[in-house]
């Protein structure tokens, strides 16, 4: 249904409210150095515009195109060239260029500083002085250090930022109350930035059939009991949500987002068992909730996956018919029954099945060619299962630091150009997969571990794209997008590798140290592991260990010591040379 | 390679019941879809019925609906197939077959028993 003003039609279909935040990230994620009074006035400027279309939707300019209204506000920007170097050349293109080309400079990892949290009483303050200025500058960090971010999530996260500080700042111990929830939103926002960076790097790097497949396999789990074509139905609209919301049109995204879970409420009858209490919700916690739905159960009487895709004569004849809508069906059915696999593994088998298919259909004996094709499945199901069996045995005996210690030093070697502030994030989110994972039940632990090392691998292949350092990282990132896992863990030592040359300042500390929390101290350490392994690859774990034990030892004893600055010059030269003879440096 | 072992078959009246069990060895079942099939007399091998890997779905041949229950327990590596309501016409060999992370199927399965005599009089 064409609109005389699209602008017109998503102001009133989103409200105000929303519209201005929606807005205000969309703005943030593009242009990402911008001070916030900037983009306050950008935003304010379009809310009046379009409430002059609301009016009139024939007046003038309001039959423009979102991306035409948002880049010539964007290109207005007196300091564009200055801040943003080449991407002002954006603005002497067209749309849809000139959208695009702004989408290329999005930076995953942008030279912003780090958000420090002001004291408590401050935030307080600040809260009950302006309330609406603090949310929305709560939008604006969030959205330019994080420019892929769901944006109609982003929404449901601000509003409960905003309802802490509503509870909390009337507590009778206010930090009690509201720091452990400002880390919980800090902790699932970051979760929820990587998943949904994911999301649009799958639908960028290897586009729309990757995303379907990806989102067949994961609603089919979660709703096993819907019939193929509800399923489809729900994937079409969900790949046209986050399209949208990839490619910068929020408003869009975030309308077509309500649209998608009042239709699934509709329906939850002939989708799951599992919606009635995320559908009695208000939108944006409706939308969360229907997102992080638990799998319903699976039917009953499910009949074997074999008389359709393998003993069919028909297999050949219903492939060439449709192949897409075939192999669909074929990971519908797989994964309705499958809540146990991985979507990567689901998809590496449908994979393996359009492959038979292919091979076969054009042989003399098509059915003797593929009747044995689910014997090829053996090997790729217990490829994951005793890997995650194995690191959960690990984790279980190491705990989560020095698990990811052991992890640094093995995707270090494995990667050793890669930077190592990258290498510290990358492993430290790898690690966390066991405290995620391991606690599960075997029948959980498969699709938790997996899935969570699909969205930690593709922080690495984005912070990588950015400035490619290593031939192993770049084809293991662009050769297949459900194979990324295992390419990575396939990796053995990089024996072209040129060891670093020693550099006694990295391994010089100061007093600072002790003052650090305990997860900025860790950092730290790993930071030094990291750089121990790039001087000394072929280093043994035991020779590591050592070291790091000596490390840990000598910031506890220097920490105590009455005059720390001098015990960490004279003891820390002590360290470094006899780490340099542990390592044979 | 995984082995199975029926047991607990025999000779039962007509209306009677009988429980049979096929134990697994040789690997854990709960990558498996479990079955059972069965050959009467001079007749062909038949397809009775099949069990998904964690027991949530169940699929029978329409001769046994109602009639016959399978469960598994994973935990001891085995499967079971609950026989009531006997007719004379269920008599005959019943094999335990497993199949690699489906159900499996008359012709469709990766291992099977050397199977249990059943006999309805």
């Known amino acids: 249904d064409a609109h005389k003003s699209e602008v017109a039609h998503r102001f009133k279909d989103l409200g105000e409210e929303n519209f201005k935040a929606l807005v205000l990230i969309a703005f943030a994620q593009y242009l990402q150095q911008c001070p916030f009074e900037d983009h306050v006035k950008l935003v304010n400027e379009v809310t009046e515009f379009a409430k002059t279309c609301v009016a009139d939707e024939s007046a003038e300019n309001c039959d423009k195109s979102l991306h035409t209204l948002f880049g010539d506000k964007l290109c207005t920007v007196a300091t564009l060239r200055e801040t943003y170097g080449e991407m002002a050349d954006c603005c002497a293109k067209q749309e849809p260029e000139r959208n695009e080309c702004f989408l290329q400079h999005k930076d995953d990892n942008p030279n912003l500083p780090r958000l420090v949290r002001p004291e408590v009483d401050v935030m307080c303050t600040a809260f009950h002085d302006n309330e609406e200025t603090f949310l929305k500058k709560y939008l604006y960090e969030i959205a330019r250090r994080h420019p892929y971010f769901y944006a109609p999530e982003l929404l449901f996260f601000a509003k409960r930022y905003k309802a802490a500080f509503t509870e909390c700042c009337q507590a009778a111990d206010k930090a009690a109350c509201l720091l452990p929830k400002l880390d919980e939103l800090r902790d699932e926002g970051k979760a929820s930035s990587a998943k949904q960076r994911l999301k649009c790097a799958s639908l960028q790097k290897f586009g729309e059939r990757a995303f379907k497949a990806w989102a067949v396999a994961r609603l089919s789990q979660r709703f096993p009991k819907a019939e193929f074509a509800e399923v489809s139905k729900l994937v079409t609209d969900l790949t046209k949500v986050h399209t949208e919301c990839c490619h910068g049109d929020l408003l869009e995204c975030a309308d077509d987002r309500a649209d998608l879970a009042k239709y699934i409420c509709e329906n939850q009858d002939s989708i799951s068992s599992k919606l009635k209490e995320c559908c009695e919700k208000p939108l944006l916690e409706k939308s969360h909730c229907i997102a992080e739905v638990e799998n319903d159960e699976m039917p009953a009487d499910l009949p074997s996956l074999a008389a359709d895709f393998v003993e069919s004569k028909d297999v050949c004849k219903n492939y060439a018919e449709a192949k897409d809508v075939f192999l669909g069906m074929f990971l519908y059915e797989y994964a309705r029954r499958h809540p146990d696999y991985s979507v990567v593994l689901l998809l590496r088998l449908a994979k393996t099945y359009e492959t038979t298919l292919e091979k076969c259909c054009a042989a003399a004996d098509p059915h003797e060619c593929y009747a044995k094709v689910f014997d090829e499945f053996k090997p790729l199901v217990e490829e994951p299962q005793n890997l995650i069996k194995q690191n959960c045995e690990l984790f279980e005996q190491l705990g989560e630091y020095k698990f990811q210690n052991a992890l640094l030093v093995r995707y270090t070697k494995k990667v050793p150009q890669v930077s190592t502030p990258t290498l510290v994030e990358v492993s430290r989110n790898l690690g966390k997969v066991g405290s995620k994972c391991c606690k599960h039940p075997e029948a959980k632990r498969m699709p938790c571990a997996e899935d969570y090392l699909s969205v930690v691998l593709n922080q690495l292949c984005v912070l990588h794209e950015k400035t490619p350092v290593s031939d192993r990282v770049t084809k293991c990132c662009t050769e297949s997008l459900v194979n990324r896992r295992p390419c990575f863990s396939a990796l053995e030592v990089d024996e072209t590798y040129v060891p670093k040359e020693f550099n006694a300042e990295t391994f010089t500390f100061h007093a600072d140290i002790c003052t650090l929390s305990e997860k900025e101290r860790q950092i730290k350490k790993q930071t030094a592991l990291v750089e121990l392994v790039k001087h000394k690859p072929k280093a043994t774990k035991e020779q590591l260990k050592a070291v790091m034990d000596d490390f840990a030892a000598f910031v506890e004893k220097c920490c105590k010591a009455d005059d720390k600055e001098t015990c960490f010059a004279e003891e820390g030269k002590k360290l470094v040379a006899a780490s340099q003879a542990a390592l044979g440096l | 390679d995984v082995q199975l072992v029926e047991s607990g078959g025999g000779l039962v009246q007509a209306g009677g019941s009988l429980r049979l069990s096929c134990a697994a060895s040789g690997g854990t079942i709960s990558n498996y879809g479990m079955g059972w099939l069965r050959q009467g007399p001079g007749k062909e091998r038949e397809f009775v019925g099949s069990?998904?890997?964690?027991?949530?779905?169940?699929h029978y041949a329409d001769s046994v609906k109602g009639r016959f229950i399978i469960s598994r327990d994973n935990a001891k590596n085995t499967v079971y197939l609950q026989m009531n309501s006997l007719k004379p016409e269920d008599t005959g060999v019943y094999y335990c077959?497993?199949?690699?992370?489906?159900?499996?199927?008359?012709?469709?399965?990766?291992?099977r028993g050397q199977g249990t005599q059943v006999t309805v009089s």
């Open positions: 069990i998904n890997w964690n027991g949530a779905t169940t």
């Open positions: 077959v497993a199949q690699f992370s489906v159900q499996p199927t008359l012709q469709t399965y990766d291992y």
